[in-house]
């Protein structure tokens, strides 16, 4: 069962698996949630002990029964991991802790104007896990305004001390705020030299990459495939680092694959969730249970529902045996990965899907698109919403995109003349406008947040957020789209689609069925040539065919320009403006969402 509350002055007795230092009980709970085995924890605050070395300790615990005896202890705070919960889990911690110094290896010292600048520096430094910033009031003159970047083997502090006039906090890489490059390529027949910080068993290079991504010290990896000549090293995933942050040497090695951690783009790619099945493969580990079930999917479901299960192997039933039920072996290990991987055994193996909720919902695979045709099918664009106004009569006003369970991203120009959010209705999971009747459920708008630099669509900043009155429950037909990652600045998107119920030609009417059009992106230089009377800024992005014919039009405004990259859809643009519709050499101009990621996160996470 999911228990989110914290228990003050309570200590959970026994079950210790590890002790780390965290600045708060809340952060201890997050660390516990991300630890492969932790189900419960006890945090010791500064008042709980006479001994300052015991302050801020976070004891991670496990229990076969998922519970431990409770003992009264002043200053202790205990709680449960969020593994048992169905809600989204994030490692993002934006909190700044005053008068605390988180200890680690201090590897960089520089002057910064503010704690925020120091945190940004940490976020944009490949090695940095957390930082301490000495304020202007710090007693030592030479240390005032000093920003210390720190790292540790575990990513958590080696100790936390009280220290007046300093502030401390964590890197925001896990909040998708890093400007570091995001290298998604996996290099075949390549091994990286450099030091190994850890090694685990993985069934393929993509699982290896995911493990590297959420390992605090891993910057890149080398994976030895099943065909690797040295049997003892097959399926071995080597987690690596270097001082420069890049591999020093690339060695040509047949049957090895190498790549990089996706820590700077982890919000827009699944890094915890290993959803594939591995046929003719056995995962070895500590056995938790053996259950007779029908099929490997049922086995995975069983593993996902068993909170301590990390991975499984399903042994299919022998013909006509046991009503077609095979044996489902639920397993776990100290690090969440199999201790050994055996091939050619006839088993089907995989991982729990419990960790999928640690990834952004937007990374979930959606139904394959129907290629060709202009009308969409249900569930094809599950982030697309239709925004209606009820004044003077109800009608479709603009498109928009779900980016969070209470947030719609749209265009600022949609709200010209809109005096109050009360007249707005957001319909989600809609394919045909004709579905919208008087009794159709909708989401009310609590707040309209328009970018404060917005004046008119053509001059940019054409972006707005709608905060919904209630939260959206995600389903196959209504789920969020990923924001582009700041680390993806150099990605060239080749699979982009514009969607909406807008006009199909300049003088037309709102369409009943959601329309879609595949449109190529156009460089800003090229776009500027087509719009000599306007300034096409880097905060805009253009798309369209030279010959015209396909474009967004009136009524599509605020809707998404969605681009698929590495199997994940990203909200690259917001339909903003253009000269006419689908005119020759007049591309559509969209708000470049990448340039507003900070603004979006600032407003939605305030």
């Amino acid at each position: 069962e999911c228990v989110t509350r914290l228990f003050k002055d309570i200590h959970f007795e026994g079950g210790d698996i590890a002790t780390v230092f965290t600045p708060s009980a809340k952060h201890c709970q997050v660390v516990c949630t991300h630890h492969p085995r932790c189900l419960l924890f006890t945090f010791t605050g500064e008042s709980a002990s006479e001994d300052p070395t015991q302050w801020f300790t976070c004891v991670l615990k496990d229990s076969v029964t998922e519970t431990l005896p409770r003992v009264n202890r002043t200053g202790a705070i205990s709680g449960y991991s969020f593994k048992q919960c169905s809600h989204q889990i994030s490692a993002c911690n934006k909190d700044i802790y005053v008068d605390l110094n988180m200890k680690g290896i201090n590897y960089n010292s520089s002057l910064a104007e503010s704690a925020q600048e120091c945190q940004e520096r940490c976020t944009d430094d490949v090695h940095c896990h957390f930082f301490t910033y000495a304020t202007r009031q710090f007693p030592s003159l030479e240390h005032r305004n000093i920003c210390l970047l720190k790292h540790t083997q575990t990513g958590t502090p080696t100790g936390i001390m009280k220290l007046d006039k300093v502030v401390t906090g964590f890197s925001l890489k896990s909040c998708a705020l890093s400007n570091l490059a995001c290298i998604r390529d996996v290099f075949p027949n390549t091994a990286f030299a450099d030091s190994n910080i850890d090694s685990v068993m993985a069934p393929d290079a993509f699982v290896c990459r995911r493990i590297c991504t959420h390992h605090p010290g891993c910057l890149f990896f080398t994976f030895f495939s099943q065909e690797w000549p040295k049997e003892s090293q097959r399926n071995l995933c080597l987690l690596k680092t270097s001082e420069s942050g890049l591999p020093s040497t690339r060695i040509k090695k047949s049957k090895a694959l190498s790549g990089f951690s996706l820590q700077s783009c982890r919000h827009s790619i699944p890094v915890f969730c290993h959803s594939s099945f591995y046929h003719d493969t056995d995962f070895l580990g500590e056995e938790l249970d053996i259950v007779a079930v029908k099929g490997h999917e049922a086995c995975q479901k069983l593993c996902t529902n068993a909170v301590r299960c990390q991975f499984f192997t399903y042994a299919p039933a022998q013909a006509s045996c046991n009503e077609g039920k095979g044996k489902c072996y639920l397993k776990l290990s100290s690090n969440g990965s199999p201790t050994k991987i055996l091939r050619g055994t006839g088993g089907i193996s995989g991982y729990t899907l419990r960790l999928c909720k640690m990834d952004n919902e937007c990374t979930t695979k959606i139904k394959p698109r129907i290629v060709g045709g202009t009308a969409s099918v249900r569930g094809e664009w599950p982030w697309q919403v239709t925004l209606h106004t009820t004044s003077p009569t109800q009608r479709h006003l603009c498109g928009g995109s779900i980016i969070g369970n209470q947030w719609i991203l749209t265009a600022a120009h949609c709200f010209y003349g809109v005096e109050s959010p009360k007249i707005l209705r957001v319909y989600i999971g809609i394919l045909n406008q004709s579905e919208i009747k008087e009794d159709t459920s909708f989401f009310g708008v609590q707040e309209i947040i328009i970018h404060d630099q917005y004046k008119m669509a053509e001059s940019g900043y054409d972006i707005a957020l709608l905060k919904l009155e209630t939260t959206v429950n995600y389903t196959d037909s209504q789920r969020p789209i990923c924001l582009p990652s700041k680390g993806d600045r150099n990605v060239i998107y080749t699979d982009c689609w514009v969607t909406g119920w807008g006009y199909r030609k300049l003088r037309d009417k709102i369409q009943n069925t959601l329309q879609k059009a595949k449109i190529p992106l156009v460089t800003n230089d090229e776009c500027q040539k087509r719009y000599r009377g306007h300034k096409i800024t880097h905060k805009m992005i253009c798309a369209g065919y030279r010959e015209g014919g396909k474009d967004a039009c009136k009524g599509d405004s605020g809707g998404p320009l969605s681009c698929k990259h590495n199997e994940v859809w990203h909200l690259v643009g917001i339909t903003s403006w253009g000269e006419g519709c689908a005119q020759r050499e007049r591309p559509g101009v969209y708000t470049n969402v990448l340039e507003y990621v900070d603004w979006i996160l600032e407003k939605t996470q305030a």
């Epitope: 110094n101 002057l111 030592s140 240390h143």
Partner: antibody, heavy 124, light 107 residues
Framework: EVQLVQSGAEVKKPGASVKVSCKAS????????MHWVRQAPGQGLEWMGI????????SYAQKFQGRVTMTRDTSTSTVYMELSSLRSEDTAVYYC?????????????????WGQGTTVTVSS | EIVMTQSPATLSVSPGERATLSCRAS??????LAWYQQKPGQAPRLLIY???TRATGIPARFSGSGSGTEFTLTISSLQSEDFAVYYC?????????FGGGTKVEIK
């Protein structure tokens, strides 16, 4: 052994410039700040400025602003102090001195290691 | 800038006796004060930092006290090698400033 070794004595004409070097050894050069202090004959100590060898940031005493430049070369663990538009009152012994350890936060410190000093004589 | 004033300018003391040197700041420097010893023809040597903490290798006969604007360096029993000039220095604000020095000479 931690030490700071400075360049040799200099004799300069008024209006000229002088560049004094200070080579550090026995510790991590970029982890400590470096100060420059001078002492005119028979006078007390006068602080001139500071450099952070890691990023190269500097802070100078108002009196020397516009005339002094402090630089560093991390490859040779050397800091330099250049004083331009020399006048006779710049005749002094110039010292480099190691300041705070910048990779740890602590409240109090002093200049714990000093160079042997470089005598600069300004005379026409 | 913060002006540091040392007194007396010269202190005549016999070996084995106690010497007390004063340093006054024109405004509070908290405990951000260091003391240095300088012998003729040599570079200064750090004795005390943080107003009262002895630097590495400094004998226990040297002690520092005070905070805010009034500071004292005490040499409990003067040895022959202690006859030198002593400077105080504030580390509380830019520019760093030194006192004019106190010369401790043999009586």
């Amino acid at each position: 052994e931690v030490q700071l070794v400075q360049s040799g004595a200099e004799v300069k004409k008024p209006g000229a410039s002088v560049k004094v070097s200070c080579k550090a050894s026995g510790y991590t050069f970029t982890s400590y700040s470096m100060h420059w202090v001078r002492q005119a004959p028979g006078q007390g100590l006068e602080w001139m400025g500071i450099i952070n060898p890691s990023g190269g940031s500097t802070s100078y005493a108002q009196k020397f602003q516009g005339r002094v430049t402090m630089t560093r070369d991390t490859s040779t663990s050397t800091v330099y102090m250049e004083l331009s538009s020399l006048r006779s009152e710049d005749t002094a012994v110039y010292y480099c001195a190691r300041g705070a350890y910048l990779l740890e936060l602590y409240y109090y410190y002093g200049m714990d290691v000093w160079g042997q000093g470089t005598t600069v004589t300004v005379s026409s | 800038e913060i002006v540091m004033t040392q007194s007396p300018a010269t202190l005549s003391v016999s070996p084995g006796e106690r010497a007390t040197l004063s340093c006054r700041a024109s405004q509070s420097v908290s405990s951000n004060l260091a003391w240095y010893q300088q012998k003729p023809g040599q570079a200064p040597r750090l004795l005390i930092y943080g107003a009262s903490t002895r630097a590495t290798g400094i004998p226990a006969r040297f002690s520092g006290s005070g905070s805010g604007t009034e500071f004292t360096l005490t040499i409990s029993s003067l040895q022959s090698e202690d006859f030198a000039v002593y400077y105080c220095q504030q580390f509380n604000d830019w520019p760093l400033t030194f006192g004019g020095g106190t010369k401790v000479e043999i009586k």
